[in-house]
């Protein structure tokens, strides 16, 4: 069964996926798709890497970790209820039927709005948690808290750039 991950509406969701590349310049193609992993490839691809680059992604999806070291964990920005569902991380190891497939279930909960909510945001167990501060008007800076593959908690500031929702394709 799928491993379950949770986030609240308006937060960033984090879906972990890792492998160990032979070298930083000798990577394995990876695809992320919405829906369970099919027999081949990924369905409804939201992000794809090749042996060197992230060569396809859509606007709210990006890699939080260093994909050159095999951290291909997916971040989905500003999630809505429609982002709920199964996601497939597929490590496309060369050879017949060698792919590693991971189905991750994302559960989006409605945002909790309470009169007692403080400037530090909601402290529920949703991952990642965010502390958002306005900066320069057009950007906000968000403290993203997540757990890496060693179980270590990581906090990092991430600029939430507001985009037009377009699809970006390289190459």
């Amino acid at each position: 069964s799928e491993v379950e991950y949770r986030a609240e509406v308006g937060q960033n969701a984090y879906l972990p996926c890792f492998y160990t590349p032979a070298a930083p310049g000798n990577l394995v193609p990876v695809c992320w798709g919405k829906g369970a992993c099919p027999v081949f490839e990924c369905g409804n691809v939201v992000l794809r890497t090749d042996e060197r680059d992230v060569n396809y992604w859509t606007s709210r999806y990006w890699l939080n970790g260093d994909f050159r070291k095999g951290d291909v964990s997916l971040t989905i920005e500003n999630v809505t209820l429609a982002d709920s569902g199964i996601y497939c991380c597929r490590i496309q190891i060369p050879g017949i039927m060698n792919d590693e497939k991971f189905n991750l279930k994302l559960v989006i909960k409605p945002a909790k709005v309470t009169p007692a909510q403080t400037a530090h945001g909601d402290s529920t167990t949703a991952s990642p948690r965010t502390l958002t501060t306005e900066r320069n008007g057009s950007e906000t800076q968000t403290l993203v808290t997540l757990h890496n593959n060693n179980g270590t908690k990581i906090s990092t500031w991430a600029d939430e750039i507001k985009d037009s929702g377009e699809t970006i394709r390289i190459g």
Epitope: L63, N64, F67, T156, A158, I170
Partner: antibody, heavy 121, light 107 residues
Framework: QVQLQESGPGLVKPSETLSLTCTVS??????????WNWIRQPPGKGLEWIGY???????NYNPSLKSRVTISLDTSKNQFSLKLSSVTAADTAVYYC?????????????WGQGTLVTVSS | EIVLTQSPATLSLSPGERATLSCRAS??????LAWYQQKPGQAPRLLIY???NRATGIPARFSGSGSGTDFTLTISSLEPEDFAVYYC?????????FGQGTKLEIK
């Protein structure tokens, strides 16, 4: 427009540690997808990639320098830093900071102006 | 690591002439080769990436070609501001490496 600016001592004594900082302005510093690199150029010679740091803190170094290099990040100041230990005269160079993006890995689209570091007693 | 050899070391031409700079890799780098321009006292500037793609804001007189081990940077008609040092760089194999440069000087 992204801008990078190197700063640090222009003179370092042999066997000591070279320390430089790169300040990034104009956005993108703490955004996933961008890698922050150090590259150097000895006088009259070609360029050599030293290493990178990703905004998550992940680092990677050129094998030829790995034992002496540390690159670190200060996201609160939009800065990343280079430390090169046990320097010799061969480390005299102009040191550049530069950016690349994971859509075109190791293609350096923005550079700082560079700072000359001389190793001499 | 991959060694990039640039030739000639120095190229002397006049404004308006065509410049052809060469970069040869010690093993195939597919099309993963970039070209940079560097003027005295300035940082390198990305001109061409992945062998033939012009970077943002680069004039059309700059073009790149080649694949595998042999690559060419061509400047169709030299402008006074084009006289500089040009470097090639590969990103096919880690670590990324640069050539030693070609100095393009006014004849």
């Amino acid at each position: 427009q992204v801008q990078l600016q190197e700063s640090g001592p222009g003179l370092v004594k042999p066997s000591e540690t070279l320390s430089l900082t790169c300040t990034v302005s104009g956005g993108s510093f703490s955004r996933g997808g961008y890698y922050w690199n150090w590259i150097r150029q000895p006088p009259g010679k070609g360029l050599e990639w030293i290493g990178y740091i990703y905004y998550s803190g992940s680092t990677n170094y050129n094998p030829s320098l790995k034992s002496r290099v540390t690159i670190s990040l200060d996201t609160s100041k939009n800065q990343f830093s280079l430390k090169l230990s046990s320097v010799t005269a061969a480390d005299t160079a102009v040191y550049y900071c530069a950016r690349d993006h994971y859509s075109s890995s190791w293609t350096f689209d923005y550079w700082g102006q560079g700072t000359l570091v001389t190793v001499s007693s | 690591e991959i060694v990039l050899t640039q030739s000639p070391a120095t190229l002397s031409l006049s404004p308006g002439e065509r410049a052809t700079l060469s970069c040869r890799a010690s093993q195939s780098v597919s099309s993963y080769l970039a070209w940079y321009q560097q003027k005295p006292g300035q940082a390198p500037r990305l001109l061409i990436y992945d062998a033939s793609n012009r970077a943002t804001g680069i004039p059309a007189r700059f073009s790149g070609s080649g694949s595998g081990t042999d690559f060419t940077l061509t400047i169709s008609s030299l402008e006074p501001e084009d006289f500089a040092v040009y470097y090639c760089q590969q990103r096919s194999n880690w670590p990324p490496t640069f050539g030693q440069g070609t100095k393009l000087e006014i004849k």
